[in-house]
Amino acid sequence: EEELQMIQPEKLLLVTVGKTATLHCTVTSLLPVGPVLWFRGVGPGRELIYNQKEGHFPRVTTVSDLTKRNNMDFSIRISSITPADVGTYYCVKFRKGSPENVEFKSGPGTEMALGAKPS
């Protein structure tokens, strides 16, 4: 059984205020069973950016159809970027658990920074 790897290919992503940013994340295995969530930052202060299972995240769309059984692409797009969106974004795999899912593995992170001034 292949060990799960979380791949975030870009270390740095330069974005423009007002535009859409695409944050890439792919996994190398479908196991263990459980969701992939996106966070900005690490530790207890991290911000939840996207959770497929619950919540409403109006500025976030997924690149792939996460409902497909064999999907391994958990990349997201964040629209209408502002200066307050800068930071390092992590895709994090959770293992299905009861009563709560358990964090299993995190990607290495992609730092989002402003690459152009707003017009």
């Epitope: 205020v17 900005r40 202060g45 939840l48 619950e54 969106d85």
Partner: antibody, heavy 118, light 108 residues
């Protein structure tokens, strides 16, 4: 979406008070939450914010070191612990849900009146 | 720190007429501006977000425009129930979140 504040009242300067905000009708643990206050006859002043998981907090300079925001995601409840209260803290305190992690306030509670008077 | 200045402080308009409220930011806030309505003795209510988008359940007589530093809230045909204080809020730079000082709309 419903947000209901409680815990307001009359206290003397230097005393403490804890406000609660019971949330329902949405996935509470997925959203950042805020406290906003309004002094009598005045405008709106943002007080504090807490991120969805509860580990990240921000405060207005006017309350930093005296107020503590917290949340219990298992109970769908937001709190504001207010210590060393001053007369200028007298206000209606509203809890407000944030639209996303970096957004405006899309739902407001009805407010809790805090009066600090000797 | 971004400062929001609302004008006029008070606006007196006859029923059925147009009301135009202004909010000016001290630096660009892109389109990240919301408008909230607060009726006497009530909590604020979201009207407009991202400068131009009406919130759920808001009548279409309310519209928002502008970007950068200058924003306008327009009530196309004022109703008696629109008597309230209107606040703008920016969420481009934070913390802190900032509100304007408010515009009180009175019915003539």
């Amino acid at each position: 979406v419903q947000l209901v504040e409680s815990g307001g009242g009359v206290v003397r300067p230097g005393e403490s008070l804890r406000l609660s905000c019971a949330a329902s009708g949405f996935s509470f643990s997925s959203y950042a939450m805020n406290w906003v206050r309004q002094a009598p006859g005045e405008g709106l002043e943002w007080v504090s914010r807490i991120n969805s998981g509860g580990g990240g907090t921000d405060y207005a300079e006017s309350v930093k070191g005296r107020f503590t925001i917290s949340r219990d995601n298992s109970e769908n409840t937001l709190y504001l612990q207010m210590n060393s209260l001053r007369a200028e803290d007298t206000a209606v305190y509203y809890c407000a849900k944030q639209y996303d992690w970096n957004g405006f306030f899309d739902y407001w509670g009805l407010g809790a009146l805090v009066t600090v008077s000797s | 720190e971004t400062v929001l200045t609302q004008s006029p402080a008070t606006l007196s308009v006859s029923p059925g007429e147009r009301a135009t409220l202004s909010c000016r930011a001290s630096q660009t806030v892109g389109s990240k501006l919301a408008w909230h309505q607060q009726k006497p003795g009530q909590a604020p209510r979201l009207l407009i977000y991202d400068a131009t988008n009406r919130a759920t359940g808001i009548p279409d007589r309310f519209s928002g425009s502008g970007s950068g530093t200058d924003f306008t809230l327009t009530i196309s045909s004022l109703q008696t129930e629109d008597s309230a204080v209107y606040y703008c809020q920016q969420y481009y730079y934070w913390p802190p979140y900032r509100f304007g000082g408010g515009t009180k709309v009175e019915i003539k």
